[in-house]
């Protein structure tokens, strides 16, 4: 239902949300601030060399529920957190990488720089 003189088509938010963006700034961002009708996010994931990389930005309303659910992806260490409670709320999000699985260790707790996907296909 529409209320408060609201005139947009139904969306989760009656107003635009501003988020900090880093490594994930769209063309319409300014000074590392993006805008969205959905969520702000911060994500940590490993790059190809196993180095943790933190990314932040905006997620549009479409499909953001799924993206913010942080479903585990096989062979990929990644964690995402989302927020909407205030502008630039993702400055205060600090997701951590999920713990290494046993199969990610070889010869003790030394993490492979590259995930060898074929290890998981017998």
């Amino acid at each position: 239902k529409k209320e408060d003189g609201e005139s947009t088509a139904p969306t989760a938010r009656p107003k635009v949300l501003r988020c900090k963006c880093h490594h994930h700034c769209p063309e319409d961002s300014v000074n590392n601030i993006c805008s969205t009708d959905g969520y702000c996010f911060t994500m940590i994931e490993e790059d190809d060399s196993g180095t943790p990389v933190v990314t932040s930005g905006c997620l549009g309303l479409e499909g953001s529920d799924f993206q913010c659910r942080d479903t585990p992806i096989p062979h990929q260490r990644r964690s995402i957190e989302c927020c909407t409670e205030r502008n630039e709320c993702n400055k205060d999000l600090h997701p951590t990488l999920p713990p290494l699985k046993d199969r990610d260790f070889v010869d003790g707790p030394i993490h492979h720089k590259h995930h060898h996907h074929h290890h998981h296909h017998h």
Epitope: E6, K15, V16, R18, D28, I33, C34, D37, G60, N87
Partner: antibody, heavy 116, light 112 residues
């Protein structure tokens, strides 16, 4: 119904400051941004900046940084724009306007005259 | 900043005529969310602007269906199918995709 109430006119001296008010009614004040727009006689519209009353987060047009300061008083559902170091170039009509993803309601405008 | 170029600057019409106003932006107004935040406003003499069309083609509540917005990307048009006396004034296009938000210079719709 949505209303944005502004004083009709302000007369101020060069070099001084002025604080223009905009009292909102007919909707939940914190659910929308409040924008401010400048219009000089016979000229177009210029976006000054905006404030989100829910967290007082502001965005400014670079051109008006240092000139305009946006604030809100949520207890009275009132937005304010302070303009400093006034010159004749600041003489204009200033509108407050409700913004979600676009401006849907405007105040009636405050005519600011800077004159000695 | 995104420059909004409106044509014509002045549009003399007879009541009952169709009127057409164009607005071109210096860059695409398609937002990263997929929305296009392009809008039309009418400022009647001595009044504040009022919203006519939001997000390219959506008529705001109470706006007659003789007003029609269209376009995409960088090129947009407002058509008034049968001009009435109450439609006279200055029409502004506007974008809220890119900060700072910007407006066209206005098109004055007047009686021929």
């Amino acid at each position: 119904q949505v209303q944005l109430l502004q004083p009709g006119a302000e007369l101020v001296k060069p070099g001084s400051s002025v604080k223009v008010s905009c009292k909102a009614s007919g909707y939940t004040f914190t659910n929308y941004w409040m924008q401010w727009v400048k219009q000089r006689p016979g000229q177009g519209l210029e976006w000054i900046g905006e404030i989100d009353p829910s967290d007082t987060y502001t965005l400014y047009n670079q051109k008006f940084k240092g000139k305009a300061t946006l604030t809100v008083d949520t207890s009275s559902s009132t937005a304010y724009m302070q303009l400093s170091s006034l010159t004749s170039e600041d003489s204009a009509v200033y509108y407050c306007a409700r913004f979600g993803y676009y401006v849907d309601y405007w105040g009636q405008g405050t005519t600011l005259t800077v004159s000695s | 900043d995104v420059v909004m170029t409106q044509t014509p600057l002045s549009l003399p019409v007879s009541l009952g005529d169709q009127a057409s106003i164009s607005c071109r932006s210096s860059q695409s107004l398609v937002h990263s969310t997929g929305n296009t935040y392009f809008h039309w406003y009418l400022q009647k003499p001595g009044q504040s602007p009022e919203l006519l069309i939001y997000k390219v083609s959506n008529r705001f509540s109470g706006v007659p269906d003789r007003f029609r917005g269209s376009g995409s990307g960088t090129d947009f048009t407002l058509k008034i199918s049968r001009v009435e006396a109450e439609d006279l004034g200055v029409y502004f296009c506007s974008q809220s995709t890119h900060v700072p938000f910007t407006f066209g210079s206005g098109t004055k719709l007047e009686i021929k």
